[in-house]
Interface confidence: medium
């Protein structure tokens, strides 16, 4: 018959906040200052993120979790975990290579971040434009033209929306 035995990795006993120190006979050593391990069984600790410059600290680093950053006023986060900080613009604008620029006609941005998006095309839903769009606000769609009382007029709807990924230049 074949006898099997399981050899447990001694490092698996090292909890979060420690690392398995090969230089000390695989003893669980605490993470050094400014480092952390968020899971058990780690052979190294990760260096804590430092929130410098336009980044500011939202959550301090601990032995078991990384620091979390956000952005100083006038900037906003981009990407996962606030990878980058980007300058705010005004509503009705978007950030371009040449700085903040007004949204092109037919597009809007109701926030200080992000890009100008096309006005809703009310006619795609068989509706009419009840309130015109602006650089800061989308159009408001109302009842379909057929539902309007005689003599009522509707504004000509804007051009169809862009495909995903495009931005007005």
């Amino acid at each position: 018959f074949e006898r099997t035995r399981s050899l447990q990795d001694p490092c698996s006993n090292c909890p979060a906040g420690t690392f398995c120190d090969n230089n000390r006979n695989q003893i669980c050593s605490p993470c050094p200052p400014n480092s952390f391990s968020s899971a058990g069984g780690q052979r190294t600790c990760d260096i804590c993120r430092q929130c410098k410059g336009v980044f500011r600290t939202r959550k301090e680093c601990s032995s078991t979790s990384n620091a979390e950053c956000d952005c100083t006023p006038g900037f906003h986060c981009l990407g996962a975990g606030c990878s980058m900080c980007e300058q705010d613009c005004k509503q009705g604008q978007e950030l371009t290579k040449k700085g903040c620029k007004d949204c092109c006609f037919g597009t809007f941005n109701d926030q200080k971040r992000g890009i100008c998006r096309p006005w809703t095309n009310c006619s795609l839903d068989g509706k009419s434009v009840l309130v015109n769009g602006t650089k800061e606000r989308d159009v408001v769609c109302g009842p379909s033209p057929a539902d309007l009382s005689p003599g009522a007029s509707s504004v000509t709807p804007p051009a169809p929306a862009r495909e995903p990924g495009h931005s007005p230049q």
């Epitope: 981009l78 996962a80 992000g114 890009i115 998006r117 995903p164 990924g165 495009h166 931005s167 230049q169």
Partner: nanobody, 115 residues
Amino acid sequence: QVQLVESGGGLVQPGGSLRLSCSASGDIFSIMFWYRQAPGKQREYVSHITSNGRTNYADSVTGRFTISRDNSKNTLYLQMNSLRAEDTAVYYCAADDATNTRTYWGQGTLVTVSS
């Protein structure tokens, strides 16, 4: 439904080149990113490009990697030159929605740099 699908990963020798692609659908994206995660390491930022062409790179890839975007095809690219062993990782495409309030992720493509 938002979908980001990466392709172009593979095995390459040190000093070689690869071009990664990411096909995007389902939303308007203000910014698209490349991140990477090496075995046993934290995920790290590589590069991003905005819808109007502004780009940025991590220090470790500056001068070697080039990000680009074809808005007509809704596709993101990463041209990787002078590859090093330390570039070995799963490379992820990510994208922020038009309001920079949500980040979407692809499934990743493995790049292995080895002789």
